[in-house]
Interface confidence: low
């Protein structure tokens, strides 16, 4: 299993990972929306985006990982596994992983998955924008 780094990645490395994550995230979201027609725009989950202890924009891998582990059984496992693999690189060793539970109700579960995918895509765009506009 990949060992989480004990240091922060350079912005250039973070950008590379985000560029890997972006098409996977976008594809998952588009596919889910097309298959689950009629689901409302969702604010069901509040996906943490940035690490609070870094001056540079840095995705909070430790906080986001459990959401993807939670939605994995009802999503495209192959793509989710690749997202988890990339998020693991962004995980800081000191940061513990929280437990995230899927809602029991089927409709709520769908909303939860949609929210995670929407918010993660938005998070990636936000961080990428910050990295592109900031000093390198």
């Amino acid at each position: 299993s990949h060992m989480a780094p004990t240091h922060r990645l350079q912005p250039s490395d973070v950008r590379k990972i985000i560029l890997e994550l972006r098409p996977m995230s976008k594809g998952l979201l588009q596919d889910y929306v097309s298959k689950e027609i009629g689901l409302p725009e969702s604010n069901h989950s509040s996906l943490p985006c940035l690490s609070s202890d870094s001056q540079l924009p840095h995705i909070n891998g430790s906080a986001i990982l459990p959401y993807f582990r939670a939605i994995r059984p009802l999503s495209d496992k192959n793509t989710i596994d690749k997202i988890i693999e990339q998020l693991d690189k962004l995980k800081f060793q000191r940061e513990p992983e929280a437990e995230v539970s899927m809602p029991a109700d089927n409709f709520e579960r769908k909303n939860f998955i949609l929210a995670v995918l929407q918010q993660f895509s938005a998070c990636l765009e936000h961080v990428l924008q910050s990295l592109n506009s900031g000093p390198q």
Epitope: Q30, L74, K77, M102
Partner: antibody
Framework: DVQLVESGGDLVKPGGSLRLTCSVT????????WNWVRQAPGKGLQWVAY???????DYADSVKGRFTISRDNAKNTLYLQLNNLKAEDTATYYC????????????WGQGTLVTVSS | EIQMTQSPSSLSASPGDRVTISCRAS??????????MHWYQQKPGQSPKLLIY???NLESGVPSRFSGSGSGTDFTLTISSLEPEDAATYYC?????????FGGGTKLEIK
Amino acid sequence: DVQLVESGGDLVKPGGSLRLTCSVTGDSITSGYWNWVRQAPGKGLQWVAYISYSGITDYADSVKGRFTISRDNAKNTLYLQLNNLKAEDTATYYCARYGNYGYAMDYWGQGTLVTVSS
Amino acid sequence: EIQMTQSPSSLSASPGDRVTISCRASESVDTYGNSFMHWYQQKPGQSPKLLIYRASNLESGVPSRFSGSGSGTDFTLTISSLEPEDAATYYCQQSYEDPWTFGGGTKLEIK
């Protein structure tokens, strides 16, 4: 209605190469999953490979490193490149769509026969 | 990889008979109330055709005499009243995890 039409099957010698084509109408290959499944003469079905809407690919262990699945979005066409062919690759190769959000193969092509023999 | 075991490998039955085919997975294919198990029919010289998806859902256009049941590792395809055109080989398949795997098939012959 969704239609899948395979072509490219042929008689090839061991160690040889072949490219199979699956032309899709009625659905976009940039949505869902698109698979190759094979069936040796008189035998059962074996999943070979898939390419997902986001371009993610996966392969059966028996073909990893020898077969490559790809697509041409503009032509709405899938391909399976078969290299270093072995006698045990002799089979009818079917193209199939995974529907129901990646749950089951709901549309299949008619198949194309690949024969590997010296 | 998940191994799929179908039984019987072949059977012979008469029109009007009730027929059951079993499929056992080497591990559970259930998650969040879904069973990722499907059934296909393949007639001689034809492509496979989806009959049942997610254990018990009848695919559009499939006659209602076909039904599926089961969860976890044990699943059954039932034909309530056999018709001559049901002569075919039937396969179960799991999509719970990669690689997606099929059962060995059950060849159904009509007497």
